[in-house]
Amino acid sequence: LTLVAPSSVFEGDSIVLKCQGEQNWKIQKMAYHKDNKELSVFKKFSDFLIQSAVLSDSGNYFCSTKGQLFLWDKTSNIVKIKVQELFQRPVLTASSFQPIEGGPVSLKCETRLSPQRLDVQLQFCFFRENQVLGSGWSSSPELQISAVWSEDTGSYWCKAETVTHRIRKQSLQSQIHVQRIPISNVSLEIRAPGGQVTEGQKLILLCSVAGGTGNVTFSWYREATGTSMGKKTQRSLSAELEIPAVKESDAGKYYCRADNGHVPIQSKVVNIPVRIPVSRPVLTLRSPGAQAAVGDLLELHCEALRGSPPILYQFYHEDVTLGNSSAPSGGGASFNLSLTAEHSGNYSCEANNGLGAQCSEAVPVSISGPDGYRRDLMTAGV
C-alpha cells in the first residue's frame, strides 16, 4: 500500500493524497491518517483533497485499508508534508503613533512573500476599531491620511490577503493617540469698510488663534455686560462674527475667547468707537435787523445735530463756495459775511466728517438798500 503526496506545499495550495494498492484487492474500507488521527474513511480507494492548505495541515500522513476482519490490515508508507508560509503575518507601522492633530499620518501594512512565490499578488485593507479606512481593499500596502483629529485616536490594524482570497492574515492592533495642541495667543481684530466702524455699516469681529488644533469654539463678549454675543465652533484658526448694521450703542469694549477642550484662552480687550455720519445740517442766518441790508454783517451758522467730530462745514451762496469752518469737537460753525447788493440769493451749508457729506436746505436772502438786488444785473434769459 503506497501513499502518494507532495512533501512541500504553500499555504493556500490544494493537497491531493493518493492511496494506491493492488487493483484486485478486496477492501472493506480505507482511511487517511494524519499524525495517527483518522482523517477520513472511504468504502473504496479514493483520493483525499485538502482544498486550501494551512500551516496546521503540516504533519505525517499515511493511509490504511481494512479487509474482512475488523483490524486495519495494511498500512502505507508515511509521507511528511510541510506547509510553508506564503507570506508573513503583516505588521502595521505608522509614520507616527502620536501624531499632532490636524497633521498627516501614513500607515503601512508590511509583510514578506516567500522567495519561491514572489509572483503571488496581495491586497491590503486598513481598519480603525472595526471601521474600514480609505476606500477599502487596495493593492497598495500604504494608506495616507491627510489629517487626523482627536476623534481618530484608537486601535488600528491591517489585513493582507491573496487576490484569490485563499489566504488572509491580520496584523496585531496598534494604538494611535492623536495629540491635541492647546490654544495659544488669541487676538480680536476689527474689520470695517474703510478701516473705521461707522453707524449703519457692516462690522466684522475676527477672533484668531496663533496655534491650537481640533475643533475650536470661538465666542465673542461685550466687556460691559460680559454676555456672549455669539459662538462658533469650527476646525480653523479664526472665526468671524458679523454685525450687519452697527448702531451707535454698539460702541464699547469687546473681547473674544477660544477653546479647544483644554484651557479657554481670552483675547485682550479691544475698544470699538462707532463713528456717526453727519445728519442733515441746519443753516441759521443772523443779521442785525429783521431785513438784511447792504453793509450788514450776516452770520451764517451751520450745525449738524448728529455726527462724530471733527466736522468740516462749508458755506455756499448759490453754487459758490464762500468758505469753510471746522468744528473739532463737534457742534456747529459760523461764517460771517459783509453784505453787498449782490449777496441776495440762496444760501446753504454742507457738513462733512469724512463719512459722507450732507447739505442743508437752501435759505433765501434778499438785500434791501440802494440798488436793491437784481440777480447779477441780468435781465436776458438763456
Epitope: 453793509g295 463756495t321 459783509s338 453787498t340 440802494p370 447779477d376 444785473l377 438763456v382
Partner: antibody, heavy 116, light 108 residues
C-alpha cells in the same frame, strides 16, 4: 448808467510805487464789491484782489500780497490800488471791475509801464 | 488754485460760420463759469455767466454750455464784430477767481 473811470497811463521807474484810481458812477458805490485785475502783455488776466467799499474789507490773491494795496474813498466813490516796489514784471494794464463773483462792469484800464 | 485751460490760442473762422471756443477746468467748478469778449485796446465785456446764462444786451448768437470741468462758448453766424479775444473765468471758491489764457478769433 454804471461807469468805472480809471486814471491815465503811468510811466514809473523800477523800485518806485504808484497809485491807480477807479471812480465809480451810476450806482451806489458802497453796495458792490470792487475787484482789480491785471492783464500782462501776454494777454493773461489775473485777479489781484477785492475790496468791499462799505467797510474797506480786502481779500488778496496770495501772489499779490505785499505788491498791491486796495483802498476806497467813499466820499468820492473812488477805489484805489497802490502798486509797491515796481519791477518790469509789473508792466501791464490794470483794470478795476465791479462784481461779486463775475464782472459785468469794467473800467477802461490803466497802462503801467515800469522802465528806467 | 483752479487752472482754466483754453487749449486753442487762435481760431480761424469765416463770417457766417459757427465756432466753438472751449475751456477746461482743473477741477469741478459746477457751473460757476463766465465768458468775456475783449477787443484790442478795450476792456473785457461780460457775455455769459453761470456757464449758460446770457448777460443782458448780449446777442443770442452767443451760447454757453457745459458743467463740471468742460465748458464751451459757441458763436453761431459769426459777424465781423465778433473777431476778438475770448476769456473764460471760474468763480467756484470765493474769492480765488482764475481766468483762461484766452482764445483769439480771426478771419480765415
Amino acid at each position: 448808467e454804471v461807469q468805472l473811470q480809471q486814471s491815465g497811463p503811468e510811466l514809473v521807474k523800477p523800485g518806485a510805487s504808484m497809485k491807480i484810481s477807479c471812480e465809480a458812477s451810476g450806482y451806489s458805490f458802497t453796495a458792490y464789491i470792487m475787484n482789480w485785475v491785471k492783464q500782462s502783455r501776454g494777454k493773461n488776466l489775473e485777479w489781484i484782489g477785492l475790496i468791499n467799499p462799505y467797510n474797506g474789507e480786502t481779500t488778496y490773491n496770495q501772489k499779490f500780497k505785499g505788491k498791491a494795496t486796495l483802498t476806497v474813498d467813499q466820499s468820492s466813490s473812488t477805489a484805489y490800488m497802490e502798486l509797491l516796489s515796481l519791477t518790469s514784471e509789473d508792466s501791464a494794464v490794470y483794470f478795476c471791475a465791479r462784481g461779486l463773483y463775475w464782472f459785468p462792469y469794467w473800467g477802461q484800464g490803466t497802462l503801467v509801464t515800469v522802465s528806467a | 488754485d483752479i487752472v482754466m485751460t483754453q487749449s486753442q490760442r487762435f481760431m480761424s473762422t469765416s463770417l457766417g460760420d459757427r465756432v466753438s471756443v472751449t475751456c477746461k477746468a482743473s477741477q469741478n467748478v459746477i457751473t460757476n463759469v463766465a465768458w468775456y469778449q475783449q477787443k484790442p485796446g478795450q476792456s473785457p465785456k461780460a457775455l455769459i455767466y453761470s456757464a449758460s446764462y446770457r448777460y443782458s444786451g448780449v446777442p443770442d448768437r452767443f451760447t454757453g454750455s457745459g458743467s463740471g470741468t468742460d465748458f464751451t462758448l459757441t458763436i453761431s453766424n459769426v459777424q465781423s464784430e465778433d473777431l476778438a479775444e475770448y476769456f473764460c473765468q471760474q468763480y467756484t471758491n470765493y474769492p480765488m477767481w482764475t481766468f483762461g489764457g484766452g482764445t483769439r478769433l480771426e478771419i480765415k
